[in-house]
């Protein structure tokens, strides 16, 4: 008797944060025995979708012609094979962008900064939002939240940084999530650019996680700082 | 040319229903912006009815004297936006405008507003 | 709930004058302020953002300056075109809220 089947890969493409209306793939690699496969999303009746597998037989795709808010969501998918069912893939969250408007981003006192000071990104809703996320390019784990607690809804969220050195320096842009769905996001702020001077001498922080970081080195999360400047907010990174 | 247009005032009887329509041009309401209904009675103030995000979801929010008795809403399609007032009353008579909610903040875009006279 | 409180609600006032009209928050709005000016018969017309931001094409003769809850709305030479009525708004939008605006301030000839 075999052991369980290896479970499958679930992948989005062209990612799995997408914009309203656009359209998004989605793959489920298993192997070349697979007869079928199956996509189910949470808290949605299984199976979401069924899908016969591509030649030659090791993946299937599940189309998603526009994005729209019923997508969004944790999948996980399953092939079977001769022999029964697959284990699960590792989850698939897709998010979409554009449930919201999109907040304001800026940074006090400045986003001109000398290294070694401090500053502080601000993310800034019309309307009360209970998640805030950062996010700054090309790094490796983008993700910043602040999320409230107990349902309670914020209007903004700081995301200090402290002590800044060369590696803060980047284009930051922020969103913000209602309680419906965490995988519905705003719209993308207009980007921030934050510029640290001084950095030639900067020596390249330890990619440990030290809560000194706020925003840290694309080689580790960013990281929160300081004291939650409203007590309904809890950090969470990832 | 980047403009908003309401239609649909005009003279109703107290307890009557009177469906306003807000139509943009030149920009796309399901872009970044909230899009809000102000009133202004004759020789009186401005005052706010309510707001609707033009992300997918549609948010809505509204004062809180409106107690139900309006409702916000929008066509994508169409590109405009809804106000649907229900069990109006003489005090309901003002000028209806819409007005967009620029990324600064402010309603930096209005429209040329619609008179609705409630009496019998 | 945010109470937005416009004073003074009349000032008579001539061409030449330097004019200022104050609009209080009930709690902090940061700089989310906008003042507009309203003709008779016509819309409202954004005259400044962000407490201070000057809209495009409007004269320098205005300005605007706060933040948190004291906000100021000054004319520093009063022009005949200017006799108008000037109201100040909030940029928050909640469910809690019984207007964004302030009540007004008329400025009259005196």
């Known amino acids: 008797q075999a052991g369980p089947l290896p479970k499958p890969t679930l992948w989005a493409e062209p990612g799995s944060v997408i914009s309203w209306g656009n359209s998004v793939t989605i793959w489920c690699q298993g192997t070349l025995e697979a007869r079928e496969y199956r996509l189910d999303k949470e808290e949605s009746p299984a199976p979401w979708d069924r899908q016969n597998p591509l030649e030659p037989k090791n993946k299937a795709r599940f189309s998603i012609p526009s994005m729209t808010e019923d997508y969004a969501g944790r999948y996980r998918c399953y092939y079977r094979s001769p022999v029964g069912w697959s284990q699960p893939s590792d989850p698939l969250e897709l998010v979409m962008t554009g449930a919201y408007s999109k907040p304001t981003l800026s940074a006090l006192p400045s986003p001109l900064v000398t290294s070694g000071k401090s500053v502080t990104l601000l993310c800034q809703s019309r309307s009360p939002m209970d998640t805030f996320l950062l996010i700054k390019e090309r790094a490796a784990h983008p993700l910043l939240h602040l999320r409230s607690e107990h349902g309670a809804q914020q209007h903004q969220a700081e995301f200090p940084m402290s002590p800044v050195t060369s590696v803060h320096g980047g284009t930051y842009r922020c969103f913000s999530s209602h309680g419906f769905s965490h995988y519905l996001l705003s719209h993308p702020s207009d980007p921030l650019e934050l510029i640290v001077s001084g950095s030639l001498e900067d020596p390249r922080p330890s990619p440990t996680r030290s809560v000194s970081t706020a925003a840290g080195p694309e080689d580790q999360p960013l990281m929160p700082t300081g004291s939650v400047p409203h007590s309904g907010l809890r950090r969470h990174w990832e | 040319e980047v403009q908003l247009v309401e239609s649909g005032g005009g003279l109703v009887q107290p307890g009557g229903s009177l469906r306003l329509s807000c139509a943009a041009s030149g920009f796309s309401l399901s872009s970044s912006y909230w899009i809000s209904w102000v009133r202004q009675a004759p020789g009186k103030g401005l005052e706010w009815i309510g707001s609707i995000d033009s992300g997918s979801v549609g948010i809505t929010y509204y004062a809180t004297w409106v107690k139900g008795r309006f409702t916000i809403s929008r066509d994508n399609s169409k590109n405009t936006l809804y106000l649907q007032m229900n069990s109006l009353r003489a005090e309901d008579t003002a000028v209806y405008y819409c007005a967009r909610h620029g990324d600064n903040w402010a309603l930096d875009l209005w429209g040329q507003g619609t008179l609705v006279t409630v009496s019998s | 709930d945010i109470q937005m409180t416009q004073s003074p609600s009349t000032l008579s006032a001539s061409v030449g004058d330097r004019v200022t009209i104050t609009c209080r928050a009930s709690?902090?709005?940061?700089?989310?302020l906008a003042w507009y000016q309203q003709k008779p018969g016509k819309a409202p017309k954004l005259l400044i953002y962000k407490a201070s931001t000057l809209a495009s094409g409007v004269p320098s003769r205005f300005s605007g300056s706060g933040s948190g809850t004291e906000f100021t709305l000054t004319i520093s030479s009063l022009q005949p075109d200017d006799f108008a009525t000037y109201y100040c708004q909030h940029g928050y939008i909640r469910g809690d809220l019984d207007n964004v605006f302030g009540g007004g301030t008329k400025v009259e000839i005196k």
């Open positions: 709690q902090s709005i940061n700089q989310w």
